[in-house]
């Protein structure tokens, strides 16, 4: 038992927020300022991420967890852990190499990020157009032409199994 204990890595006892200091006979030392260790048994502490420039601090660094960044207003996060910030555009626009450009006719973007997408082609789905699309919003398709023919019933369909939840009225 004694032998097993002596063979055990003493660094494994060092908790998160500390590191196993080789310069001090493998004593567990607290992470220095602006560094952290998120797991036990670490031989070094990692340098805290600094949220500078277009990044802003969402969560401060602590001895056991890294700082988390997001983007300043007018920008949005891209990549894992918000590794990049990309400029926002207005709804109805998309970001190009030359900056924000309005969506071309027949396309829309209902967000401040991403690309313009084509309006739904209602007729491809056997539907008519209820409301035309805009740069900021897709078309709303309406009833199928068959529903509009003389003699078609206007009975409300049966209740859906699960009620949808979309834009509030």
């Amino acid at each position: 038992f004694e032998r097993t204990r002596s063979l055990q890595d003493p660094c494994s006892n060092c908790p998160a927020g500390t590191f196993c200091d080789n310069n001090r006979n493998q004593i567990c030392s607290p992470c220095p300022p602006n560094s952290f260790s998120s797991a036990g048994g670490q031989r070094t502490c990692d340098i805290c991420r600094q949220c500078k420039g277009v990044f802003r601090t969402r969560k401060e660094c602590s001895s056991t967890s890294n700082a988390e960044c997001d983007c300043t207003p007018g920008f949005h996060c891209l990549g894992a852990g918000c590794s990049m910030c990309e400029q926002d555009c207005k709804q109805g626009q998309e970001l190009t190499k030359k900056g924000c450009k309005d969506c071309c006719f027949g396309t829309f973007n209902d967000q401040k990020r991403g690309i313009c997408r084509p309006w739904t082609n209602c007729s491809l789905d056997g539907k008519s157009v209820l409301v035309n699309g805009t740069k900021e919003r897709d078309v709303v398709c309406g009833p199928s032409p068959a529903d509009l023919s003389p003699g078609a019933s206007s009975v409300t369909p049966p209740a859906p199994a699960r009620e949808p939840g979309h834009s509030p009225q």
């Epitope: 409301v131 919003r137 309406g142 979309h166 834009s167």
Partner: nanobody
């Protein structure tokens, strides 16, 4: 489920006005757009006017532009059609219609169209 009930139809002389109402009840939170359709005897049902419930954006059939106005009161879950300068050719059954979901299809492949039972509008001298 969404229920739609129209009211305000009737007989009116040419040149006069009428206001139709469509009261929605049930899962009105899911409605993204509403419209008024009309159907004259033996004819196809046609779109008269439509409105996005969120931003109030409207569309009109050419035949009613400048005469009809569609509007909504979201607090009352009611849509209106103000019909001015009525003509005999406006005579039809007017139906309220509601749509849940943009594009043509709904989340998880479902789609929902809701109709009212209709209200008769007769323009005659």
């Amino acid at each position: 489920q969404v229920q739609l009930v129209e009211s305000g139809g009737g007989v009116v002389q040419p040149g006069r006005s009428l206001r139709l109402s469509c009261a929605a009840s049930g899962s009105t939170f899911s409605i993204v757009a509403m419209g008024w359709y009309r159907q004259a005897p033996g004819k196809q049902r046609e779109l008269v006017a439509s409105i996005i419930t969120g931003d109030g954006d409207t569309n009109y059939a050419d035949s009613v532009k400048g005469r009809f106005t569609i509007s909504r009161d979201n607090s009352k879950n009611t849509m209106y059609l103000q019909m001015n300068s009525l003509k005999p050719e406006d005579t039809a059954v007017y139906y309220c219609y509601a749509r849940t979901g943009y594009g043509s299809s709904w989340l998880m492949g479902h789609e929902y169209d809701y109709w009212g039972q209709g209200t008769q509008v007769t323009v005659s001298s």
